[in-house]
């Protein structure tokens, strides 16, 4: 074979999203018959020649950034995406509210606003059983992007997370849930309670307001200040994407 | 922290094999990352294998991997080092080092995270 070997994928189960003291197994995965596997987290030093890790309690020391690679014969795959395991419940809850209520009517406008008592300068909002809420922004996103109307798929449990950039996986713990009801329509949401929560965006400010725009399930961002969309790594690629969007400087 | 004694070191031939045995004491012996480094003369200590707390998952360097093995007994509270295929080239002192870190975490590589460290045993491989 010319050239490297396809990467394998790496998954945490079950959710990437581990709160403090909770199990949560990596598993690297890769074509039948591999030589070797080789799991790392990335800018540690640390390693193991497993396809799988399991971590019976979740600490803050084992959040970070991992990938896995694996070896047959002399050839080594090309890396597999980097997964983000993230320790939730490091801090304090923060309090997820509607504007101008959480029952708004279809075709009507919605602000999803996050509020944290530190000094957070992230945050993200996760619709449950969503399992892929995100698709590559096509564009970037400035506070005068409109704000697109609300249609049935959108009623709903939200919660958020905030955390800070300078330790970008150790989060809060979520938020207490919020039901967004939209009202005036007989469609019934498409709903998956056994999924994992799934990320629906990331946010910047303090104290953000995040406009939630539906469109093609892509959730976008307003608030009093210019935001700059910058997609970083996404996910684990057998997980839900996940894309960051971080204020611009 | 662990108390470490190595034991098994001496003068083995080209092609030959040693087991090498670290005996500790110490109450953090089971939640402790187990490591094997080593020391040729005039050259930094270098990781050699590393035992993840339950002994499920192992890290080698390319150096040894398929020729060295590693593994612990936890009842015994021991770590081995089993060398087959040795060559002049492995001639150092062997060290036993143990690392605290939480359950979970992946065999570090790096000196720094190993807190415990036996006084080491000396192998020699020559004709």
């Known amino acids: 074979q010319s050239g490297p070997l396809p990467k394998p994928s790496l998954q945490a189960l079950p959710s990437s999203l581990v709160p403090l003291e909770k199990p949560v197994t990596l598993r690297c995965q890769g074509p039948p018959g591999v030589d070797l596997y080789r799991l790392e987290k990335l800018s540690s030093s640390r390693y193991q020649d497993q396809a799988v890790l399991f971590i019976p309690a979740m600490k803050r020391s084992l959040a970070g950034r991992y990938r896995c690679s694996y070896q047959n014969g002399s050839l080594w795959s090309l890396p597999s995406d980097q997964l983000e395991l993230v320790a939730t419940g490091v801090f304090a809850k923060p309090s997820l509210s509607a504007q101008p209520g959480p029952a708004v009517s279809s075709g009507g406008d919605v602000t999803l606003q996050c509020q944290t008592r530190y000094g957070f300068d992230q945050f993200a909002l996760y619709k449950e059983g969503d399992p892929a809420p995100y698709k590559n922004p096509e564009r970037w996103y400035r506070a005068s992007f409109p704000i697109i109307t609300v249609t049935a798929a959108h009623s709903g449990t939200y919660r958020c997370y905030s955390f800070s950039s300078r330790d970008p996986y150790l989060w809060s713990a979520p938020s207490d849930p919020l039901e967004l009801v939209v009202t005036g329509t007989s469609v019934t949401p498409s709903r998956l309670p056994t999924e994992p929560p799934s990320p629906v965006a990331e946010f910047s400010e303090a104290t953000a307001e995040l406009t939630v725009s539906f469109t093609n399930e892509v959730f976008t961002t307003e608030t009093s200040r210019s935001i700059t969309a910058s997609p970083k790594e996404s996910d684990s690629p057998a997980g839900p994407a996940r894309q960051y969007y971080t204020k611009g400087n | 922290q662990v108390q470490l004694q190595e034991s098994g070191g001496g003068l083995v031939q080209p092609g030959g094999s040693l087991r090498l045995s670290c005996a500790a004491s110490?109450?953090?012996?089971?939640?402790?990352?187990m490591g094997w480094f080593h020391q040729a003369p005039g050259k930094e200590r270098e990781f050699l294998a590393g035992i993840s707390w339950s002994g499920a998952n192992t890290y080698y360097a390319d150096s040894v991997r398929g020729r060295f093995t590693i593994s612990r007994d936890n009842a015994k509270n021991t770590v081995s080092l089993q060398m087959n295929s040795l060559n002049p080239e492995d001639t150092a002192v062997y060290y036993c080092?143990?690392?605290?870190?939480?359950?979970?975490?992946?065999?570090?590589?790096?000196?720094?995270?190993?807190?415990?460290w036996g006084r080491g045993t000396q192998v020699t491989v020559s004709s």
């Open positions: 080092a143990a690392d605290p870190s939480h359950p979970g975490s992946l065999i570090s590589t790096r000196r720094s995270d190993y807190d415990s």
């Open positions: 110490g109450r953090t012996f089971t939640r402790s990352i």
